[in-house]
Structure formats: structure tokens, C-alpha cells
Interface confidence: medium
């Protein structure tokens, strides 16, 4: 999606199915404010931003309103009337789901099941990582739906959990997004803990889907 | 299950419009798009154009001037109307639903619908 | 738009054979391909989306492969329930466009 034309690399993602961001940057036209010109039906006049992002006082995106969208975003990036990038991508391509909402933990001796609010949209992945300040890295489980028991966990050890959504390779493409992790949270023998002891900082999330 | 059902005309006449109803059940359209595309011996299979979920149309430009496809969400009803049909419009049309989003392949197809343009 | 070609209009094989048929684009579909079968009563299924991926319900002795412009899907073990017509299906480009299909019969 990074093509460049005239020296112009976008960027697009479609935060859970409702705005979509496009920023961009273009060296050449560092010190000017481009204007960005969208359509989304192929036949019809292309509309001008109203919401633009702005780095260093100049434009370098554009957020967009696109409820529940699976169509093509047609755009024009233009310095006055003269286009610098213009083309026409797939937003669901670069869908981002939201980050897990209302994570509750529910505790059954050496198993936990982790749930949250399904998104309003299927063909997703709910996953729940895991450590203790025993392990080397993460373990990872994940499910369909925003509900992931993990089992053989060790009552008296102290676990730290966060949780993330993805969208599914083979539904919407190679080339999504997973969702913002949510906050990690730490228990021990059933309750809530402010931390693990000698828990290393939690990596930052992989983009590998 | 996922099905799609076709109701419309066996025969129209030259210079008069064809208008096909595809009513879906087992999903929603809201969630996914439906595509229709026709079948005739001397053209194979053409996609004709698709609905998307949020209700905007893409249309092939060979046929953009004359087909109108639209849809009542609550009703689960897609509707294709074709203007100004002559004789090598005759051709089976099939609706067909959207799958995979990233992948735009037409999951699962209506019966057929087939038309004959004669007088 | 992009013309899909499937050079084999019609194919002849035994049961228990395994059988390739071809497609070509007009420039490179990115593996953008998808496989569908007609039955001979005229009903249309898919059978792979992007290249090599099987639709749910689909079995496994239906395959595919190739990059670029050029495509193939592959029945390991033909049987019976296999005979009918395949099509190509370009999901690039709008419009999309299909090959002219590959009917398939028993020697």
C-alpha cells in the first residue's frame, strides 16, 4: 500500500470498520499543505477532506467516516489543482479492529477463561497472551469468539494477561492489522494483582499476523 | 445455511427491461455484498455488477449505462433491473454472495434465472 | 479488463486420475484467482479463492497453485461427483472476469 508516486508514500488504515485514516508523506512537498480529494463510488465527484491530520503545522492524512464498508476508496492527493498521488485500494485490506473491551477474567482452579465484548463483525481472532515471571516468553491462546478458557495454569504462580483482536488472514487479506493490545492485567490464586514480581516490560505487539 | 433464491421473468421482450429479484437467507445484507453475473454460450460467464454491504453498486462499464442493482436490507432482497435487453442478452443471470472480504470470490450462487429476449 | 484464458475447453479422464487444468491472465492478477465448478444441472460453487485456498466444505483433492499470470487447479483422485465445468474467476481488477471454462468428461 506504501506506493509512491512523485516521491508520495501512503499509508491507509480502517479503524474497526468505522474511519478510515489515510496519511502520507511526501518529501518533495514537505513545507506545503496537499489536499486530499476522496470518492467512494467510481462515477461519482470526488469530495475534499474535512478532517485533516497535521504533522509540523502541514496535512499529512485524512480521516474519513466509513461505517461498515467493503467497497474502494477512490482518492487524490493534490498540491493545488495538480495530483501528486492518486489511485483506488480496498479498505477492508487494512482493517485494524478495536482493542478488547470490558476483559473480565474468570477464575476455576488451575483454569481461567478470559471473555470481552465481541466486535460487531465476524471472522475475527480473540487472543489472550499469558506469562508468568517464570517463563521466557509469552504463551498465546486464541478463539472465534471473545471467549478463551487456558487451562493448566499454576494457582499459585502470579500470570500477567492482555488480549488483542485480529482479523482473519484467509477472510480479509494478508495485509491487516491487529488491533491495539488491551492493558495488561496480573493475577494470583484467583485475584487481581497490581503486578508480577520481576515481570520484564511486556514486549511490544508483533505486527506479524 | 446460506442460500439464495431467484424470482423473475423466463422471457422478455426486445427494447423492454429485465427485472430479477435474489432473496437471501443465512446471512445478513448488511454483512456481505452480492454479486450477478450472467451465463449466455456465446459470451461464457460475465460479472455483470455487486452491491456492496454498506449499498454502494460497481458496475461493468459494459453494462453501466443500463443496469440498476439495489437492495432492501430488512426484506433481505437485492434487485436487478436491466434496461433496453435485445437478443444476445438471452443468458441464465445468477446473483451470488460476496465472500471473504479480502478476496472478493463469489461463495455461494443462486439458482439461475434464465431469461430468453424474444418477441 | 483483463481476459482470462483457459486454453483446454474440454478435458477427458478416468476415475481415480488426476487431472490439471489450466488459466492465464492478460497481465499479472496477483494471485487473485478463483476456481468455480458448474454441476451439469447448472449449479455454480466455489471451490479455491486466492490462488490455493479451499472453500469451507470443499474436498481436499481439489488444489491450487501459480503466481503471476498463470494458474492451475488440480483434482488428485477424480470421481464421479467431479464431472462438470470449471471456471477462472480474476478478482485483481474491476471487472472482474472469468476463463471460458474447462468441461470435464469420463474417457
Known amino acids: 500500500q506504501g506506493g509512491a508516486a512523485e516521491g508520495v508514500q501512503i499509508q491507509i488504515i480502517y479503524f474497526n470498520l468505522e474511519t478510515v485514516q489515510v496519511t502520507w508523506n511526501a518529501s518533495k512537498y514537505s513545507r506545503t499543505n496537499l489536499t486530499f480529494h476522496y470518492r467512494f463510488n467510481g462515477d461519482e465527484a470526488y469530495d475534499q477532506c474535512t478532517n485533516y491530520l497535521l504533522q509540523e503545522g502541514h496535512t499529512s492524512g485524512c480521516l474519513l467516516d466509513a461505517e461498515q464498508r467493503d467497497d474502494i476508496l477512490y482518492f487524490s492527493i493534490r498540491n493545488g489543482t495538480h495530483p501528486v498521488f492518486t489511485a483506488s485500494r480496498w479498505m477492508v485490506y487494512y482493517l485494524k479492529p478495536s482493542s478488547p473491551k470490558h476483559v473480565r477474567f474468570s477464575w476455576h482452579q488451575d483454569a481461567v477463561t478470559v471473555t470481552c465484548s465481541d466486535l460487531s463483525y465476524g471472522d475475527l481472532l480473540y487472543e489472550v497472551q499469558y506469562r508468568s515471571p517464570f517463563d521466557t516468553e509469552w504463551q498465546s491462546k486464541q478463539e472465534n469468539t471473545c471467549n478463551v478458557t487456558i487451562e493448566g495454569l499454576d494457582a499459585e504462580k502470579c500470570y500477567s494477561f492482555w488480549v488483542r483482536v485480529k482479523a482473519m488472514e484467509d477472510v480479509y487479506g494478508p495485509d491487516t492489522y491487529p488491533s491495539d493490545w488491551s492493558e495488561v492485567t496480573c493475577w494470583q490464586r484467583g485475584e487481581i494483582r497490581d503486578a508480577c514480581a520481576e515481570t520484564p516490560t511486556p514486549p511490544k505487539p508483533k505486527l506479524s499476523k | 445455511q446460506v442460500q439464495l433464491k431467484q424470482s423473475g421473468p423466463g422471457l422478455v421482450q426486445p427494447s423492454q427491461s429485465l427485472s430479477i429479484t435474489c432473496t437471501v437467507s443465512g446471512f445478513s445484507l448488511t454483512t456481505y455484498g452480492v454479486h450477478w453475473v450472467r451465463q449466455s454460450p456465446g459470451k461464457g460467464l460475465e460479472w455483470l455488477g455487486v452491491i456492496w454491504r454498506g449499498g454502494n453498486t460497481a458496475y461493468n462499464p459494459a453494462f453501466m449505462s443500463r443496469l440498476s442493482i439495489t437492495k432492501d436490507n430488512s426484506k433481505s432482497q437485492v434487485f436487478f433491473k436491466m434496461n433496453s435487453l435485445q437478443a444476445d442478452d438471452t443468458a441464465i443471470y445468477h446473483c451470488a454472495k460476496k465472500s471473504y472480504y479480502g478476496y472478493h470470490a463469489m461463495g455461494y450462487w443462486g439458482q439461475g434465472t434464465s431469461v430468453t429476449v424474444s418477441s | 479488463d483483463i481476459q482470462m484464458t483457459q486454453t483446454t475447453s474440454s478435458l477427458s479422464a478416468s476415475l481415480g486420475d488426476r487431472v490439471t487444468i489450466n488459466c492465464r491472465a492478460s497481465?499479472?492478477?496477483?494471485?487473485?484467482l478463483n476456481w468455480y465448478q458448474q454441476n451439469p444441472d447448472g449449479t455454480v460453487k466455489l471451490l479455491i479463492y486466492y490462488t490455493s485456498r479451499l472453500h469451507s466444505g470443499v474436498p481436499s483433492r481439489f488444489s491450487g497453485s501459480g503466481s503471476g499470470t498463470d494458474y492451475s487447479l488440480t483434482i488428485s483422485n477424480l470421481e464421479q461427483e467431479d464431472i462438470a465445468t470449471y471456471f477462472c474467476?480474476?478478482?485483481?481488477?474491476?471487472?472482474?472476469?472469468f476463463g471460458g471454462g474447462t468441461k470435464l468428461e469420463i474417457k
Open positions: 497481465q499479472d492478477i496477483s494471485n487473485y
Open positions: 474467476q480474476q478478482a485483481n481488477t474491476l471487472p472482474w472476469t
